[in-house]
């Protein structure tokens, strides 16, 4: 049942004398494995025999015995699959048929392969793209229907019979589908290339010439011109004549039209190949070409540049840069239509010429307020000197200058005082419109450049101003010098450094931080009472009767300041202590007697003692000594004695007397 | 000993107004002048103003002009600082000084009150 | 006002070597009768500030004599001549010449 094989391989191979050819080949026999294996070369069936006559070229059997004049022939197959053949090398009577006769264990089939073997190899076969255009990239592809394992070729492409320099790509195919070496230039042809001769060889493995294709190249262009000009070198006066001659070199296809172009436009009614021009003018200088056109588009010639002579037209003058700050470089141009180009110039400052300065170009590396004014100048060349044209005008800008700050006040100026000042200037360019002050205060300005100060402050030591127009101009400060009352007026305790006892030496200091003027005077004054007038107040042996509240003042011509007022506090032992008796010193039995220890103490007694007329001390520590009720026996003189953190003080004795109540005298 | 003792910490609203407390003790409290000093959480220390406890006169900072209002009760020996219309930036740690009679430096310092503004 | 810069800011101690501190003032400090209302305080961390130096070089009480204070008119430094562990903290200058008073912006001293 042939339904059951099914094959796959090139229908046709091809090959030369002494090549070889290699046979891919793919089969399925779906009821087993292949068993037995023939090629015949031009198989034919014997209806007597029912098998194959032919050439057997090729037979493996059962037991897998091969014939040993079978070598040229290999069987590369397998037995289920693959049924690919080499045949090495072939020669001339292979070509013809190829039966694959196959058989499995119940099926049989012949298969038949054409093989083409000529005498000697046969030409590759170049193919091109329907058109090729200069400059556009084409690819070039050579085509050989063969391609063996066993024998190596290689495809060379040759334009003119030379190599050519672009890289080629080969590849080969040898598949079931397609047997063939190919061969890929990508080239970009120049005009130039039309009707040139291009090649693809066929060489062996050594390189040896085996065949070749050759095609000639129709390479489409524009038309390629060339210009000629009388005069030759393109130069002339105004006045001459000039022929110009437009040949076309190559074309493909042929040029259909003509025509003239001047910087780029084209010259009207000039459609032959000569163009004449008669008395010519200055205007008609410039790059002159000619332009023929064919089905690919237009082509252009070399261009021909036309110089027509004239001398020098009136001139301008261009700054850069106007205007120009001071200190900073300008360069004036001189510019002025002439050919040749000028060969000399004569600057003009003011209308006055500047020596020495011949050239296109004047550089001021450095320009100064004087350089301001008009600049022109004149240019000359071999036909002549130009006129001198308007000039241009060169704005000098500066800072302003001699900038200074003035103060407008009688001196001295006092603490307290307005103080005016103005801001003054020599000269400015472009004008003053503004003006700043240093440092900056919440003052007025009444009117530009003009600064009033309310209420100056002491500590205002200098003011600078500045003149503005683009930049600003700084004068150098000016002291206002304000005088003022003598300031942070405090009074220092010089010693002693800790608390200040009774009888210590005592020395007050009146300090301040500053005075303007610096001549002072000194007060120390002491609850509203003038002390003393000297820098500082001196105790020899401090009493209690000095402390209370100090203050120092500090005069200078402007006035007087004081200090914050400050406590002298003098720290002493308990004195002055006296027994005081309630309701008095002669008290009755049985009433009620209270003694009070009195005392001046800094800091306050801390603690009291008692005594009595024997100096026993009595168990009593407060200030006041009760006695309830009071007994003839407590008559007597008793003193105090009141402690502190400085020292021990005592009373003098006091009396006490004790009377007898009526009762009690009535009852004796 | 000498010493300044102030009242505790404070937690207030924006817009609230805070009384901290300053009393002196070991030493004659009218014979010294007092000044109040604060100091923002991670910030250096900033002068409030100062007053004068014999005569109870007083001088502030430009900066709280206005909201700071300092007294004394000379019969408790104690200073008082009040600050009103507080804001988050019055967040602080308040102390109270006392300036040495003889240099004007500030030789004993209260323990500070935390003020939170939030 | 009175404006005092400090510097540094910060200041990495190695303990054993002396440290120094700037303090500089807008304007002088010196008096008529010659002193330097310039003080230094230090306040240790979570303390309050505490007296060193008043009047530009006199020791505050209790205050060891590894520190000194120097300088006149507008420029002052505190000195420790050999830096301890407790001396850590921030230091501060005030001007005590006027009202206001003023302080520096500190120097943190830390060991390294």
């Known amino acids: 049942d042939s339904s059951k094989w099914v094959f796959e391989h090139p229908e046709t191979l091809y090959a030369w004398e002494g090549a070889c050819v290699w046979i891919p080949c793919t089969y399925r026999a779906l009821d087993g494995d292949l068993e037995s294996f023939i090629l015949f070369h031009n198989p034919e069936y014997n209806k007597n025999t029912s098998k194959f006559d032919g050439t057997r070229l090729y037979e493996s059997t059962k037991d897998g015995k091969v014939p040993s004049e079978q070598k040229r022939v290999q069987f590369l197959g397998d037995k289920n699959k693959n049924c690919t053949l080499s045949i090495h090398p072939v020669h001339l009577n292979d070509s013809g048929q190829l039966g694959l006769r196959m058989e499995s264990k119940t099926e049989k089939w012949m298969e038949r392969i054409h093989l083409n073997v000529s005498e000697r190899p046969f030409p590759p076969h170049i193919q091109l793209p329907p058109e090729i255009q200069e400059s556009q990239e084409v690819t070039l592809t050579c085509l050989l229907n063969f391609s063996c394992y066993g024998y190596p070729i290689q495809l060379q492409w040759l334009l003119e019979g030379v190599p050519m320099r672009q890289a080629a790509v080969t590849s080969t195919s040898l598949t079931i589908k397609s047997v063939f070496t190919r061969s890929e230039l990508k080239f970009s042809p120049q005009w130039s290339h039309h009707g040139k001769i291009v090649t693809c060889q066929l060489q062996d493995a050594d390189g040896k010439f085996l065949s070749n294709d050759t095609v000639q190249l129709n390479v489409k262009h524009t038309p390629k011109l060339e210009i000629k000009v009388t005069p030759s070198d393109a130069i002339v006066r105004e006045g001459d004549s000039v022929t110009m001659t437009c040949e076309v070199s190559s074309s493909n296809p042929e040029y259909t039209t003509v025509s003239w172009l001047k910087d780029g436009t084209s010259l009207k009614k000039q459609n032959t190949f000569t163009l004449n021009l008669r008395e010519v003018t200055k205007d008609q200088s410039g790059k002159y070409c000619c332009q023929v056109s064919n089905d690919v588009g237009p082509g252009r010639s070399e261009e021909v540049f036309l110089q027509v002579q004239y001398a020098p037209e009136p001139s301008t003058v261009q700054i850069l840069h106007s205007p120009a700050v001071e200190g900073s470089q300008v360069e004036f141009l001189c510019m002025s239509l002439a050919n040749p180009l000028p060969t000399n110039y004569t600057w003009y400052h003011n209308g006055k010429e500047m020596q020495g300065r011949t050239e296109e170009k004047v550089h001021i590396p450095k320009i100064l307020p004087w350089h301001a004014g008009t600049y022109s100048c004149v240019a000359e060349n071999i036909l002549g000197t130009g006129q001198r044209g308007p000039g241009a005008e060169l704005d000098v800008q500066y800072p302003p200058k001699k900038v200074t700050t003035v103060i407008q006040n009688p001196m001295p100026i006092r603490e307290g005082d307005t103080v005016t000042l103005s801001c003054n200037y020599n000269s400015s360019n472009p004008s003053v419109t503004r003006y700043e002050w240093k440092p900056h205060g919440a003052w007025e300005e009444p009117s530009l450049g003009v600064l009033k100060i309310q209420n100056v402050g002491w500590d205002n030591t200098t003011i600078a101003c500045a003149a503005c127009n683009s930049w600003c101009s700084w004068a150098s400060p000016v002291a206002l010098n304000v005088q003022y009352a003598p300031r942070d007026v405090r009074v220092r305790k010089i010693k002693p450094l800790s608390e200040i006892h009774s009888g210590n030496s005592v020395s007050l200091q009146c300090d301040f931080s500053s005075s303007h003027p610096k001549e002072v005077q000194f007060f120390w004054e002491k609850n509203g009472r003038l002390l003393g007038k000297e820098s500082q107040l001196n105790f020899d042996s401090i009493s209690p009767e000095d402390a209370g509240s100090y203050s120092c003042w500090v005069n200078n011509s402007i006035g007087q300041t004081a200090s914050k007022a400050w406590t002298l506090e003098v720290l002493y032992a308990p004195r002055r202590l006296r027994v005081s008796m309630s309701p008095g010193d002669q008290v009755m039995e049985g009433k009620s007697a209270t003694l009070t220890c009195e005392s001046d103490a800094n800091p306050p007694v801390s603690h009291y003692t008692w005594f009595d007329w024997n100096n026993q001390s009595l168990p009593y520590h407060s200030q006041k000594l009760r006695l309830e009720p009071v007994k003839v026996q407590h008559s007597g003189a008793y003193w105090c004695q009141g402690t502190n953190s400085v020292g021990k003080g005592r009373s003098p004795l006091s009396t006490l007397t004790v009377y007898y109540s009526p009762e009690t005298i009535g009852r004796r | 000993q000498v010493q300044l003792v102030q009242s505790g910490a404070e937690v207030k609203k924006p817009g609230a107004s805070v009384k901290v407390s300053c009393k002196a003790s070991?030493?004659?409290?009218?014979?010294?002048?007092m000044h109040w000093v604060r100091q923002a959480p991670g910030q250096g220390l900033e002068w409030m103003g100062i007053?004068?406890?014999?005569?109870?006169?007083?001088s502030y900072a430009q900066k709280f002009q206005g909201r700071v209002t300092m007294t004394r009760d000379t019969s408790t020996s104690t200073v008082y600082m009040e600050l009103s219309s507080l804001r988050s930036e019055d967040t602080a740690v308040y102390y109270c000084?006392?300036?040495?009679?003889?240099?004007?430096?500030?030789?004993?310092w209260g323990q500070g009150t935390l003020v939170t503004v939030s | 006002e009175i404006v005092l810069t400090q510097s540094p800011l910060s200041l990495p101690v190695t303990p054993g070597e002396p440290a120094s501190i700037s303090c500089r003032s807008s304007?002088?400090?010196?008096?008529?009768?010659?002193?330097?209302?310039l003080d230094w305080y230090l306040q240790k961390p979570g303390q309050s500030p505490q007296l060193l130096i008043f009047?530009?070089?006199n020791r505050a009480p209790g205050v060891p004599d590894r520190f000194s204070g120097s300088g006149s008119g507008t420029d002052f430094t505190l000195n420790i001549s050999r830096v301890e562990a407790e001396d850590v903290g921030v230091y501060y200058c005030?001007?005590?010449?006027?009202?206001?008073?003023?302080f520096g912006q500190g120097t943190k001293v830390e060991i390294k």
């Open positions: 000084a006392r300036e040495d009679s003889g240099s004007g430096a500030f030789d004993i």
């Open positions: 007053i004068n406890p014999s005569g109870g006169s007083t």
């Open positions: 304007r002088s400090l010196l008096s008529y009768h010659g002193y330097n209302y």
């Open positions: 005030m001007q005590s010449l006027q009202t206001p008073r003023t």
């Open positions: 009047v530009g070089s």
């Open positions: 070991g030493y004659t409290f009218t014979s010294y002048y």
